[in-house]
């Protein structure tokens, strides 16, 4: 029986009776919350032999071991995850042991065994037989391994049952338990699983079989399984289902889950019913069960209850993440913030259509309007009073609205008002209406001529720069001298660059009124010679790298009632020289004969430049004579060579660290300092602890059911 | 895989309350789909009375509103009816059914409840 | 509510022949998301109801080509191109467009 879709088993441990009939868990396993010590051996669930997602234990006492609950849990496909995590044990107060003896199979992600107090036989499992990558599994605060004194069965009368394997240079008993062995297939099967009399299962079957070679006789399927068959792929009309099934057409189209009842139902697509469309696909039509691709971002329509949605923090923007197309009026207050700008962009850059009005009212903190970097259609089919669906009020460092250049955005209908946007210019303004089509729409009082611009310097010069120098890591650049019309209004020039990959940048990127600016800048001050044409090195640049560097003349911006006029320069692209790769990354080396070695490696992180050939060296080294120092042909244990690798294990260090001996005849001395790094990973580790918890808890603690 | 299975007593009173349970095994009832409840009288057709939610909303046939409630207890898995002032009129099969985006997909074998003094 | 009206209400059928059943709905059933949401269900005696058709012309994986279901808006039809004598039971159509659910009476098939 196929139990899902996902089992939550908390407070009251008599839940556990939902497994009994469980052959295949389709979900994750949650068993958690259970405070009072109960007595578990009555409960034993021998039929539940596979978990599709993750298996969650938390806080339940008095259970002391896995083993007799699910004696025959072979496989959990991790096909979700926790966290990261597929096995996650978590402040188990009684568990002694796993006791999993017939795991076999960590399909996908990692395992998770923190804060158990009591929890032993941990170092006794071979988990790099059960998961392909043991390196993220996080096996920390568990009791110590000296206090355990974990036993695999048969050490203590001199007659090992168990099967050897090494880990971390310790070629040790692998065992789940005092009295199971961890299970190993022979050699023969190779990546095959066996049955429990060491038989070779079907290609097909995962973990383990209950007859060698029979596609039918699997505990758990290596791919998919259908009508009672492991199978490699679905067969014609049935499609992928939960990473571990075939299922028909009808079945996909009935699915209503708690988590897809919002959408438009579960589709079909490349041979797999899923809850929606992968990225860069759209349903073909609105009720269709099958996906197209999508022609540019793919479309989302996001409606305002409310009608209008205010922006007014990061926060409010956030709802509006993916969104391509806004039913409704957006109302954008931004006062203050941290990196508004680009944070703006990530979550309203997409969208493309708002069907109501624009109104930008009291931004101080914005200097721009290219967060919107997608807009193009501004509906008006609900308007302000007056008419208007573009409104742009009172936003004091407002300088730019888009790049008319690199921008098409039409009013449908619906006029345009601006006032007191002080640095914002009038010409910006009617350019705006131009590219628009509101041309015309407009009456005298919706565009302000005097309080529109009036601290900005708004009839710009173009400065021109006059010479570019590079090296590997620095730029050198001058430029024309500015002359305004009175030499005294020029105060400094000031410098902008910034790394730029692609030719596509504009002045007003990333750029807020807070502070935050994607640009670097440097201030120039005027030569002293008159003749003298201003300059600039730019130095601490990366090698090979495209910059995109700006000069703007600093200018007093007010005289009288004038407007002044300001310069800058067009946005100059240029790029450093090249300069010596950084090293060849992941060398391996690996004897496939006895003349040949084959070599392989990956690029450099910094190719500093196009990459045109490697150079291979090597040599020949002495033998080590420590190879034959061992009878290999000998039935005794292999010598391990054991490096000496620094660490204290932190639950080892005795109360005064001081007197430890350092070894060899040197006597006592201190225990070496934390170096910066080791210091910098605790920290990291600490934190990363504290996520992880704050993630357990925030997804298994909710309110609790009417 | 899914199962449902109807219980409750075979006889009731009239005037009192029919209460019946749906235990469903292999499927959590929180987890999805709507969870119903379906009458058929004697040599008559179905009559589909109501359904409980995954999220536990509730929607009810309005000639049998004001006399019926479907609830459910998740920590066994199992939902409920309670149909108030029964008469001999109330006598029927009922059926428990989880019914998807579009269709009924797995039903108890029903259970005879008569109404009779 | 809506109400279905099936006809006939029984329906006597030669093995191998044609039968058509009809089911008239008093109001549209077109769901506001474009969808018509009407089933045909298989009662056989002594049994739940299976079904047979979802969304007026879907067959359900494993159910025989001979049946199919047509129609829109109000007018549904399931036709069995051949009967067969594993096919008698009674026939319900059901919309689960618009709450309350409801089926038809009933067609009552059976071999003359």
């Known amino acids: 029986e196929i139990c899902g879709p996902g089992i939550d088993i908390r407070n009251d441990y008599q839940q556990l009776k939902r497994l009994e009939n469980c052959t295949v868990i389709e979900g994750y396993l949650h068993i958690l919350l259970i405070s009072k010590a109960e007595d578990y051996r009555s409960y034993r669930f021998p039929k539940l032999t596979v978990i599709t997602e993750y298996l969650l234990l938390f806080r339940v006492a008095g259970l002391e071991s896995l083993g007799d609950l699910f004696p025959n849990l072979t496989v959990i496909r991790g096909w979700k995850l926790f966290y990261n995590y597929a096995l996650v044990i978590f402040e188990m107060t009684n568990l002694k042991d796993i006791g999993l003896y017939n795991l076999r199979n960590i399909t996908r992600g990692a395992i998770r065994i923190e804060k158990n107090a009591d929890l032993c036989y941990l170092s006794t499992v071979d988990w790099s037989l059960i998961l392909d990558a043991v390196s993220n599994n996080y096996i920390v605060g568990n009791k110590p391994p000296k206090e355990c004194g974990d036993l695999c069965p048969g050490t203590m009368e001199e007659k090992p049952m168990c099967e050897k394997t090494t880990i971390n240079n310790e070629y040790n008993y692998r065992c789940w338990t005092t009295n199971r062995c961890q299970k190993m297939c022979p050699s023969t099967c190779g990546k095959r699983a066996c049955t429990e009399n060491n038989e070779c299962c079907h290609p097909e079957c995962l973990g383990s079989c209950s007859a060698p070679d029979n596609d039918t006789a699997c505990v758990a399927c290596r791919h998919y399984y259908y009508a009672g068959v492991c199978v490699p792929a679905c067969p014609p009309n049935t499609y992928r289902f939960e990473g571990w099934r075939c299922v028909d057409r009808d079945f996909c189209a009935n699915i209503l889950s708690a988590e897809s009842s919002d959408s438009e139902g579960f589709v079909i697509h490349d041979g797999e019913c899923m809850q929606e469309c992968p990225s860069g696909f759209i349903r073909n039509g609105s009720q269709s069960m099958y996906c197209i691709p999508c022609e540019g971002p793919c479309p989302k329509v996001c409606e305002e209850e409310k009608k209008t949605k205010t922006i007014d923090s990061v926060t409010s923007a956030q709802m509006l993440q993916g969104c391509t197309i806004f039913k409704g009026n957006l109302l954008i207050n931004i006062r203050r913030g941290n990196n508004i700008a680009s944070e703006l962009e990530n979550f309203m850059g997409l969208i493309e259509v708002v069907t109501g009005y624009v109104k930008i009212r009291h931004s101080h903190a914005l200097v721009s309007l290219s967060f919107l970097k997608n807009l193009r259609l501004i509906l008006g089919e609900e308007q302000l009073e007056g008419n208007y669906s573009f409104y742009v009020l009172d936003n004091q460092n407002l300088q730019q609205l888009w790049d008319w250049d690199h921008r098409n955005l039409t009013i449908k209908a619906g006029k345009m008002y601006f006032a007191f946007n002080p640095k914002l210019c009038v010409s910006e303004i009617y350019r705006m209406e131009e590219v628009t089509g509101t041309k015309g729409r407009q009456s005298k009082g919706d565009i302000n001529t005097r309080n529109n611009g009036e601290r900005a310097s708004c009839e710009s010069d173009v400065l021109h720069f006059t010479s570019t120098t590079t090296s590997k890591n620095r730029i050198i650049i001058t430029w024309h001298r500015y002359r305004p019309p009175d030499y005294r209004d020029l105060i400094s020039f000031t410098v902008y660059y910034k790394e730029a990959p692609f030719k596509n940048v504009t002045e007003y990127d990333g750029q807020d009124a807070c502070g935050s600016n994607s640009w670097n800048m440097v201030d120039v001050d005027l030569p002293p010679n008159k003749d003298v044409e201003p300059g600039i090195l730019l130095h601490g640049l990366k090698p090979w790298t495209q910059y995109a560097v700006y000069v703007k003349a600093v200018t007093l911006t007010m005289v009288e009632n004038d407007h002044i006029r300001g310069a800058k320069s067009e946005i100059l692209y240029i790029r450093t020289n090249a300069s010596v790769p950084s090293i060849p990354l992941d060398v391996l080396s690996a004897s496939n004969s006895s003349s040949q070695l084959i070599v392989k490696w990956n690029p450099p992180s910094l190719p500093n430049g196009n990459l045109s050939y490697y150079i291979v060296r090597w040599q020949r080294q002495p033998q080590d004579g420590y190879l034959y120092r061992h009878n290999y042909c000998s039935k005794d244990k292999i010598p391990i060579r054991k490096y000496a690798d620094g660490t204290i294990d932190i639950e080892e260090v005795t109360e005064n660290p001081k007197t430890e001996v350092c070894g060899g005849e040197k006597g006592p001395c201190c225990a070496c300092p934390k170096t910066e790094a080791e210091k910098q990973a605790e920290k990291e580790e600490a934190e990363y602890r504290k996520v992880f918890e704050n993630f357990l808890h925030n997804s298994i603690f909710v309110p609790r059911p009417e | 895989q899914v199962q449902l299975q109807e219980s409750g007593p075979g006889l009731v009173k009239p005037s009192e309350t029919l209460s019946l349970t749906c235990t469903v095994s292999?499927?959590?009832?929180?987890?999805?789909?709507?969870w119903n409840w379906i009458r058929q009288p004697p040599g008559k057709g179905l009559e589909w009375i109501g359904y409980i939610s995954y999220d536990g909303t509730n929607n009810y046939k309005p000639s049998l509103k004001d006399r019926v409630t479907i609830s459910r207890d998740t920590s066994k898995n199992q939902f409920s009816l309670k149909l108030s002032s029964v008469t001999a009129a109330d006598t029927a099969v009922y059926y428990c059914?989880?019914?998807?985006?579009?269709?009924?997909?797995?039903w108890g074998q029903g259970t005879l409840v008569t109404v009779s003094s | 509510d809506i109400v279905m009206t099936q006809s006939p209400l029984s329906l006597p059928v030669t093995p191998g022949e044609p039968a058509s059943i009809s089911c008239r709905s008093s109001?549209?059933?077109?769901?506001?998301?474009?969808?018509?949401?009407l089933q045909w269900y298989l009662q056989k005696p002594g049994q739940s109801p299976q079904l047979l058709i979802y969304?007026?012309?879907n067959r359900l994986y494993g159910v025989p080509d001979r049946f199919s279901g047509s129609g829109s808006g109000t007018d549904f039809t399931l036709k069995i191109s051949r009967v067969e004598a594993e096919d008698v039971g009674v026939y319900y159509c059901f919309q689960g467009s618009h709450v309350p659910w409801t089926f038809g009476q009933g067609t009552k098939v059976e071999i003359k």
């Open positions: 059914a989880r019914y998807g985006r579009v269709f009924f997909d797995y």
């Open positions: 969304k007026v012309s």
């Open positions: 292999g499927y959590s009832i929180t987890g999805g789909y709507h």
């Open positions: 109001q549209s059933i077109v769901h506001s998301n474009g969808n018509t949401y």
